[in-house]
């Protein structure tokens, strides 16, 4: 019998207010197993996938989205979806990314604290959480 | 059809160096974390080290037993992954296998390195 | 670092057998677990991961199970290509640590 796949989470750092030119990460986290990560914009036909999958938490795996310099392009609502086979979950909650213009450098700390959006809280890092890799190819139309 | 494909091995003097190649087909090599596992002979499996995706900052890991002497490293425009080690040991005789992550679920066929004066 | 402790290390059995392999963790790693077969010459297949999940290919006489520090392979029913050396491996934190091996021969 397959299992009920519980909806994914997804979250920003350093947060989901974000400085025209610096850099955003998105998180998506679900269950032990996940082999494919999908990260979609409010049209599911933009996505972008990530096979590297890393532990969390003993329960919980994890994937990292990276935009490295956000523009006003990137402004916007996201979610996660994941592949743990033999079937796809559900989207979490959907995150909005929302990009000022700013009169400080790149790096200047005015970012919310990291935001989250879905079922389950983040858990807090630990020692362990070098943030590990999963499987499968898919293709993607890439978000940035 | 997912394909590893090592190749670099062979025959080496203590203290020398070696480099590794796998050429990854029949997946999308950039978006999955990458291993190096090991087996000497006669011997168990040793994770030797990993490499992370550009959403990881390449981020790579090592056993204690070769870090500061080996390093992994990806081409993603080649679909290579590599493994450059140097101040060769005796006790790094061993086939090197590359695999890919987090599962290790694809594993090449291997390629024999001797260390050995 | 993470121990994994297999055992046993070698086993004799005989076809249609039931075969149970376990794998103890020096501390828990949830169900960040992974099977392999390895046969002479031959490089590791995966059979299990996450503790319990088939693989694409293998065969459901193999099955997982265990979380937290406990964990255990089982063939229920050994055909003659089952022979071989298996290892587990933890994924939860790098080392990425493989147990010693447990060979399964022809009793």
């Known amino acids: 019998q397959e299992e009920d796949l519980p909806r994914p989470s997804i979250s920003a750092e350093p947060g989901t207010v974000i400085p025209l030119g610096s850099h955003v990460t998105f998180v998506c986290r679900g269950p032990v197993g996940v082999q494919t990560f999908r990260l979609e914009r409010e049209s599911r036909s933009t996505y972008n996938d990530t096979e590297d999958v890393s532990q969390a938490s003993p329960s919980e795996s994890e994937a990292r989205f990276r935009i490295d310099s956000v523009s006003e392009g990137n402004a916007g609502p996201y979610r996660c979806i994941y592949y743990k086979p033999p079937k796809w979950s559900e989207q979490s909650d959907y995150l909005e990314l929302l990009v000022k213009e700013t009169s400080g450098g790149p790096d200047s700390p005015d970012t919310e604290p990291g935001s989250s959006a879905g079922p389950t809280q983040r858990p807090s890092d630990n020692s362990h959480n070098e943030h590990a890799p999963a499987s499968q190819g898919l293709k993607a139309e890439h978000l940035y | 059809e997912v394909q590893l494909v090592e190749s670099g091995g062979g025959l080496v003097k203590p203290g020398g160096s070696l480099r590794l190649s796998c050429a990854a087909s029949?997946?999308?090599?950039?978006?999955?974390?990458m291993n190096w596992v090991r087996q000497a002979p006669g011997k168990g499996l040793e994770w030797v080290a990993r490499?992370?995706?550009?959403?990881?900052?390449?981020?790579?890991y090592y056993a204690d037993s070769v870090k500061d002497r080996f390093t992994i490293s990806r081409d993603d425009s080649k679909n290579t992954l590599y493994l450059q080690m140097n101040s060769l040991k005796t006790e790094d005789t061993a086939v090197y296998y590359c695999?890919?992550?987090?599962?290790?679920?694809?594993w090449g066929q291997g390629t024999l390195v001797t260390v050995s004066s | 670092d993470i121990q994994m402790t297999q055992s046993p290390s070698s086993l004799s059995a005989s076809v249609g057998d039931r075969v149970t392999i376990t794998c103890l963790a020096s501390q828990t790693i949830g169900t960040w677990l992974a099977w392999y077969q390895q046969k002479p010459g031959k490089a590791p297949k995966l059979l299990i991961y996450a503790a319990t999940s088939l693989a694409d290919g293998v065969p459901s006489r193999f099955s997982g199970s265990g979380s937290g520090t406990d964990f255990t392979l089982t063939i229920s029913s050994l055909q003659p290509e089952d022979f071989a050396t298996y290892y587990c491996?933890?994924?939860?934190?790098?080392?990425?640590?493989f147990g010693g091996g447990t060979k399964v021969e022809i009793k």
């Open positions: 491996q933890q994924l939860y934190s790098t080392p990425y640590t």
């Open positions: 490499i992370r995706t550009k959403n990881n900052n390449f981020a790579t």
């Open positions: 029949g997946f999308t090599f950039n978006i999955n974390a």
């Open positions: 695999v890919r992550g987090p599962y290790f679920d694809y």
